[in-house]
């Protein structure tokens, strides 16, 4: 059990070490590619974690100008790093009712990082409920 | 356990060529933003040249001192990031490094290659 | 370029007792409340080995008598009480725009 509950605070600090990185580009908004990617919202329960893999896979890009290059792409390539699994995000991965990332409307950088600040808090909200009630599962 | 292992290093006369390699393990390399650092014999470092990874579609960055003169390049497949070094100085004679760049600072090197460049 | 000025360049110290190095950066290394400023040390004969990276947060398996403070232009580098295997040289290193760039470094031996 203490291993499994140091998994769950592992996830947590992860969770809100994003949502850290999630700011700090959010800094940058100017210095990104205006492009529209996939911004998922409104994501329907167990479909949190097929979401949240949208917005990771997204292609947020550096303008590749000026001198916030290196920090922008250091911090996009933080948010691409794996979390630590949970048992909910173990078994929303073989849900194949989610809808698929190009099936969600398309926003530029700034409200797309919006869009996933707001996820990544209400995946930390589930997962503090979900531990207030004695279950594992987030 | 990380490991970066460098060769190629050796003694080569001014206007030469020498090829470095740095063979990785223990971590994706394929994810990895991978960067040459260079120690001059008694001095401090200096960073060379990196290239990032295939998501970032491999671009490359070098100091002005080596900038035309040294390509660096990787490949996946084996792990290895090289370091082509043409028309060399004798300023180029250093210990050269392999480094991982993991989100914010140099957290794993090599133990270094030797290149003396003499007449 | 940035240029990072590290003093003092050597420093002799008795073991127990505390260490301070000095780094400045040409021009502000910090922005939006982060500071791309790291610390390494190079021990006799091995490649360097990251201290404290962003500044103050202390890299895993680093003893917790190192630590890291400053921001803009001035960071400092603290050993509460130096210890024997300590020796070496330590540099600074910014991680704001390439070029990185290195201090000249502090090469601190025991008294």
């Known amino acids: 059990h203490k291993s499994s509950s140091q998994g769950q605070d592992r996830h947590m600090i992860r969770m809100r070490q994003l949502i850290d990185i999630v700011d700090q580009l959010k800094n940058y908004v100017n210095d990104l590619v205006p492009e529209f990617l996939p911004a998922p919202e409104d994501v329907e329960t167990n479909c949190e974690w097929s979401a949240f893999s949208c917005f990771q896979k997204a292609q947020l890009k550096s303008a590749n100008t000026g001198n916030n290059e290196r920090i922008i792409n250091v911090s996009i390539k933080k948010l691409k790093r794996k979390p630590p699994s949970t048992n909910a995000g173990r078994r929303q991965k073989h849900r194949l009712t989610c809808p698929s990332c190009d099936s969600y409307e398309k926003k530029p950088p700034k409200e797309f990082l919006e869009r996933f600040k707001s996820l990544l808090q209400k995946m930390i909200h589930q997962h503090l409920s979900s531990r207030t009630h004695g279950s594992e599962d987030s | 356990e990380v490991q970066l292992v460098e060769s190629g290093g050796g003694l080569v006369q001014p206007g030469g060529s020498l090829r470095l390699s740095c063979a990785a393990s223990g971590f994706t390399f394929s994810d990895a933003w991978m960067d040459w650092v260079r120690q001059a014999p008694g001095k401090g470092l200096e960073w060379v040249a990196e290239i990032r990874s295939e998501a970032d579609n491999h671009p490359t960055y070098y100091a002005e001192s080596v900038k035309g003169r040294f390509t660096i390049s990787r490949d996946d497949s084996k792990n290895s990031v090289y370091l082509q070094m043409n028309s060399l100085k004798t300023e180029d004679t250093a210990v050269y490094y392999c480094?991982?760049?993991?989100?914010?600072?140099?957290?794993?090197w090599g133990q270094g290659t030797l290149v003396t460049v003499s007449s | 370029d940035i240029v990072m000025t590290q003093t003092p360049l050597s420093l002799s110290v008795t073991p127990g007792q505390p260490a301070s190095i000095s780094c400045r950066a040409s021009?502000?290394?910090?922005?939006?409340?982060?500071?791309?400023m790291h610390w390494y040390l190079q021990k006799p004969g091995q490649p360097p080995q990251l201290l404290i990276y962003?500044?103050?947060n202390l890299e895993s398996g680093v003893p917790d008598r190192f630590s890291g403070s400053g921001s803009g232009t001035d960071f400092t580098l603290k050993i509460s009480r130096v210890e024997a295997e300590d020796v070496g040289v330590y540099y600074c290193?910014?991680?704001?725009?390439?070029?990185?760039?290195f201090g000249q470094g502090t090469k601190l031996e025991i008294k």
């Open positions: 962003l500044a103050s």
């Open positions: 290193q910014h991680s704001r725009e390439l070029p990185l760039t």
């Open positions: 021009k502000s290394v910090s922005t939006y409340g982060y500071s791309y």
């Open positions: 480094t991982e760049y993991d989100y914010e600072g140099f957290v794993h």
